[in-house]
Each structure stands twice: as C-alpha cells, then as structure tokens.
C-alpha cells in the first residue's frame, strides 16, 4: 500500500479552521491478524528522511491522534482529549483520512505528517507516511480563507515505507 | 543531540526494590518509546519492558511482569524502572534505549549510559 | 519467543583482517508485507552501553564506518568488518525486533 498527499501546501490565515488530507492507496490486506493504524504528527524540515523526527500537535502525541481498524474502514476520533486541543481526525470507507486543526495560530505553521502502519499478529509495523506544510499568515497580506496547492503527481505517489 | 542520562550505581539488599530513573534529552520525550535492558555481569543482553510516555502504558517482559513496574514524570522528562523483590541473581548493569516503533517493535537507536545495581548482603 | 543464536563466542582476529560474525534466527525476521529483515546489530565495548551500527540487516546507521556491513535474510545473517581497526575490537550482539525484543548471546571480537 502506498500514501498519497493531495496538497503538499496549505496557506490560511490565523484563526482559520483546516483540514489537512492523506489518502491510502492500493492493496490493503484484511486479514484478521492485520490491524491499521492511521494518525498524525509533526516533523521539521531539513532531516534527512522526511518525518523521521516527530513531535506532537498541539500537545497531543500520535496515540492520542489515531484511528485503528482492519482494512478500508470508516472511523474518526471521538476523543474529548482531541476535541479539546481544537483537533479532530477522520477516515472514510475510501482510504481517505484527515486531521481538522481549528482555529489555527501562527504557532500552527510547520510540517505535518500522516503515517499508515500495518501490524501483523501485534507484533512489529510496516509504515508508510506523507508529508505537508502548513503555513499559518497573519496581517494584511494573509488569504483571508486557506489557499491549497497540488502536489505534483511526482510528489503525492512519492512514498516513503519504512 | 539526543540523549539518555541515567541515574548512579546502587547496591541493594536481596528482598529490597531499586528504582532507577533515566533523563531524556533533545527530542520530543512524549513520542518515544524508552526500554529498559538488563545485562548481567559477562552475560548478553536481556530485555526488561517498554513505556510509552506520552500516554503512561508500560509492556513488560512476561519473565519481570511481577516485579517490574516502570513510570514516566513528564515534567522532568525522566522515566523510572522499579524492580522489587531483588535477588542476587539481579546483579547487572540496566541500561535504558529509545526505540523509534509507532504501534510495533523497532531497533534501538539511543542508549542511556547504564546503571549498575549490585545486589548482596 | 523468537532464539537468537550468535557464532563463534569468540573471535581471534588480527588487526587489518577481514571478520565475519554470525546470527541466526530460530524463526525467520522477514516482514512479508515490506520485504525486510527485522534484524539489528549492535557492538559494546568494555564499560560502555551497547551503539547502534545496523538495522533492516543492512542499513548501516549514521556516522558508522564503511567497513561494517551486514548481510543475510530470513533466518541467517551475517555481519562483516572489511578490515579490523583497533577500535573494533569489541563484543557484538544481533537483536531481533519482529515479535517482541530478543538479543543473541554475543560475539567477542578479540585480537589474535
């Protein structure tokens, strides 16, 4: 399975709700001793390997942040802990998940990772993971709603597995 | 850069417990599993347990589970191993590692410098 | 539980020349899903913890010297040291992390 990123660049405007996407593509095995888990973090640029470092969003670590079920399910986080921090994580039947950031700061701005991991019998993981940047504009020259740019076709197939 | 800084050598009682901490640095402690290894003096090397910090779970080794009970203190980015009811058999050097693992087992890329507890009487 | 058995114990090298150690696994450590080998190595020096030089059995970690390298797949593995420095002179240890965390017993490169 591979991890597309639609937009490798959000811009919003301080205050701004978004709603950042990832997309899990190709075969996903449903076997019953296989379990996915589908959540977020935050890395820096400049690493060697893109989102090999990780810190948490707004406070809430990966656990806190992620979906787990077999396969292409529908789930989202309910956690008051998310809600709280202004977050939200989401999946569909599609492969398609996201992370909604609410009321977004300057502080908000950086590099977001979405990671898939696959564990077989609970036992060790196969991740895949994409990476977007969030940049959060204050002032006059500030879009005054999130303007997204596309990756290249290069860019959202380009998948890093570990 | 990224560090494990633990606690001093102890010598112990049989029957008594052992707390040792170990001191995270240049990274973001919440996010990463620390484990804590054992070697026994000339012997290989034997894994204890893992914790969480972020979230507080601890996994241990089903050979310690009765005796091991590790914690974190966010505050001061440190994690703590106790083992109790100590034995001379449990005279080793405890180290403890950063795994790099989400949800899974991964390999160990930092080491904490090792602590020793000797246990006689 | 997955038994890591390491050979030799010990092994006498002079410096400059080629060392070959090796691990085998009592169940293979190949990941179907990614196609790696969920195998590290690890070398110790007296007094000292336990540094990181390879994972996936042949991914040497960074900062390692070129004359590392590990080999092998499934079940056995090898870890080879082109041309022994003195500094290499050391125990090392292969670590399997696919189900839960085993070590091998260790082999002790001494200078012959």
């Known amino acids: 399975f591979k991890v597309a990123t639609p937009y490798s660049l959000y811009v919003c405007p301080e205050g701004q709700n978004v709603t950042l996407t990832c997309r899990l593509l190709g075969p996903v095995d449903k076997g019953h001793d296989v379990t996915f888990y589908k959540t977020w973090y935050r890395s820096s640029r400049g690493e060697v390997q893109t989102c090999s470092e990780r810190r948490p969003i707004r406070n809430l670590t990966f656990q806190d942040l992620h979906l787990h079920h077999g396969g292409h399910q529908a789930a989202n986080t309910s956690h008051d802990l998310a809600q709280r921090h202004g977050l939200e994580s989401a999946s569909d039947h599609h492969g398609n998940f996201s992370i909604t950031m609410r009321n977004l700061t300057l502080l908000d701005s950086g590099l977001y990772c979405c990671l898939v991991v696959e564990i077989r019998h609970h036992h060790s993981e196969h991740r895949v993971h994409g990476a977007m940047e969030l940049q959060v504009q204050t002032g006059k020259d500030a879009p005054s709603n999130c303007v997204v740019y596309p990756s290249s076709s290069q860019d959202s197939e380009n998948i890093t597995a570990a | 850069q990224v560090q494990l800084v633990q606690s001093g050598a102890e010598v112990k009682k049989p029957g008594a417990s052992v707390k040792v901490s170990c001191k995270a640095s240049g990274y973001s402690f919440t996010d990463y599993y620390i484990n804590w290894v054992r070697q026994a003096p000339g012997q290989g090397l034997e894994w204890m347990g893992r914790?969480?910090?972020?979230?507080?779970?601890?996994y241990y080794n089903e050979k310690f589970k009765d005796r091991v009970t590790m914690t974190r203190d966010t505050s001061t980015s440190t994690v703590y191993m106790e083992l109790s009811s100590l034995r001379s058999e449990d005279t080793a050097v405890y180290y403890c590692a950063r795994d790099d693992s989400f949800y899974g087992y991964w390999y160990f890329d930092v080491w904490g410098q090792g602590t020793t507890v000797t246990v006689s009487s | 539980e997955i038994v890591m058995t390491q050979s030799p114990a010990t092994l006498s090298v002079s410096p400059g020349e080629r060392a070959t150690l090796s691990c085998k696994s009592s169940?293979?450590?190949?990941?179907?899903?990614?196609?790696?080998?969920?195998l590290a190595w690890y070398q110790q020096k007296p007094g000292q913890a336990p540094r990181l030089l390879i994972y996936w059995a042949s991914t040497r970690e960074s900062g390692i010297p070129a004359r590392f390298s590990g080999s092998g797949s499934g079940t056995e593995f090898t870890l080879t040291i082109s041309s022994l420095q003195s500094e290499d002179f050391a125990v090392y240890y292969c670590?399997?992390?696919?189900?839960?965390?085993?070590f091998g017993g260790g082999t002790k490169v001494e200078i012959k």
């Open positions: 914790i969480f910090p972020g979230s507080g779970n601890a």
């Open positions: 169940q293979s450590v190949l990941y179907s899903s990614n196609q790696k080998n969920y």
């Open positions: 670590h399997q992390y696919l189900s839960s965390y085993t």
